[in-house]
Interface confidence: low
């Protein structure tokens, strides 16, 4: 629905009248930043504002998911005249301000990236005191986290009529291709569900009917690497055992 104007509008006349970008509200963020899981990434964000010299209190905020309403992952506040932005929130301690908000720079460093960090981030600055202005990037920066495959679950489950099936779930970005190998199988991509709804980096492959005892191996591969895990099926005494 339509966003209300309070806290959601920009000084458009400054945009039109002043040729210097330093004299209007604007925010510069790249469309996307890519980094590998486990590494660190820098989310650049710089801004301009219409106040010639603003030295009052300010707050720098980063939020994830959606602008204006998404959860905050980082927040810091700088007192009047201070160049130090005191961190008030850093989700899981992994977010750190690299830029200096007094120098119109809100760039953020994200440590120890995980695939769950793959989302859009929005920077915001709030001035307080003499002026009550705040501005947030509308489109944000997409953090694209890449990762070599990792098999997160492999299991053998009973099926109707005393049969067994095997499930293999792996994560990675790009989403990995899964293949099964095992007795009388060769290599099989049987019943791959890719990716699971709501779990964008997870891929599951099912072997619907295990016809022979022995070792079944699931291999996950993408452009960054490969991973494999095995389960063992023993049907004597009607039991099954799994080992990875």
């Amino acid at each position: 629905f339509v966003r209300t104007k309070i806290d959601t509008t920009e000084n458009l006349l400054n945009t039109e009248v002043h040729s210097s970008p330093a004299q209007r509200w604007s925010m510069q963020v790249p469309p996307e930043v890519s980094a590998e899981a486990g590494d660190a990434a820098v989310l650049p964000c710089t801004f301009t504002h219409p106040h010639r010299h603003y030295d009052g209190p300010l707050t720098a905020i980063w939020r994830a998911g959606e602008p204006y309403a998404g959860p905050q992952v980082f927040r810091c506040a700088a007192a009047r005249g201070s160049e130090l932005c005191q961190t008030a929130l850093s989700l899981h301690g992994r977010f750190r301000l690299l830029g200096n908000p007094r120098r119109n720079d809100l760039s953020l460093r994200v440590e120890r990236l995980a695939l769950a960090d793959d989302r859009r981030y929005f920077c915001r600055v709030e001035f307080a005191g003499d002026v009550h202005d705040r501005y947030e990037s509308r489109h944000g920066v997409r953090l694209h986290v890449t990762a070599a495959p990792r098999i997160v679950n492999i299991s053998v489950l009973p099926s109707p009529a005393h049969a067994f099936r095997a499930l293999c779930t792996a994560e990675g970005e790009p989403p990995p291709a899964l293949a099964w190998s095992g007795p009388a199988l060769g290599n099989s991509l049987a019943a791959v569900r890719s990716p699971r709804e709501g779990h964008g980096h997870l891929v599951t492959a099912e072997l619907p009917a295990l016809t022979h005892d022995g070792r079944y191996t699931c291999t996950a591969a993408n452009s960054l690497g490969r991973s494999e895990a095995s389960v063992y099926l023993f049907r004597f005494h009607g039991a099954s055992g799994a080992s990875t």
Partner: antibody, heavy 123, light 112 residues
Framework: EIQLQQSGAEVKKPGSSVKVSCKAS????????MHWVKQAPGQGLEWIGT????????AYNQKFKGKATLTADRSTSTAYMELSSLRSEDTAVYYC????????????????WGQGTLVTVSS | DIVMTQSPLSLPVTPGEPASISCRST???????????LYWYLQKPGQSPQLLIY???NLASGVPDRFSGSGSGTDFTLKISRVEAEDVGVYYC?????????FGGGTKVEIK
Amino acid sequence: EIQLQQSGAEVKKPGSSVKVSCKASGYTFTDYDMHWVKQAPGQGLEWIGTIDPETGGTAYNQKFKGKATLTADRSTSTAYMELSSLRSEDTAVYYCTSFYYTYSNYDVGFAYWGQGTLVTVSS
Amino acid sequence: DIVMTQSPLSLPVTPGEPASISCRSTKSLLHSNGNTYLYWYLQKPGQSPQLLIYRMSNLASGVPDRFSGSGSGTDFTLKISRVEAEDVGVYYCMQHLEYPFTFGGGTKVEIK
């Protein structure tokens, strides 16, 4: 240069409908909310409602619910207001007006206006 | 709905003299963020309205500095320090605090 170009004057019969257009240029259409304002002959200004061209979301003055329908075509950067079941009291000049916004409170109100469209309802 | 009331209805002015228009709202237009969401527009004869003042006291770009806005949460004033012939028209105040946005009834400024 930002401009809002409205469609020409219309003469309509009571009970009929009319669709007024407002073509925006000089800016990214989806970055502005479009508002519509009514001015009856010799009268003041009345806010009808607004549409967010990016999402199609609308907000109406209760008085104009069921009378005015706001739409927007992003492909042509044009906003529309359709007035239905026209009566003589709908005779007025209708303005579209907009201003840029993003997630900040540094607004300036309705800085840009169309030239107005006169809708005359007469049998 | 917030009701906006303007006075006077008509204001005859002498070029070079000051002029003042009042506007009152039935609810405070002061938001918790410190902004007062009151705006002034001028509609010259045969033209679309144009913005004069935004957020109670900020002069819109291109508007001569003889115009100024002031007020509190519910009582507002538009002042013209020295009226010029081109200032004739109908002046409207408007609240932009909440839907539906509402205008005052207008004040017609004309040269004596």
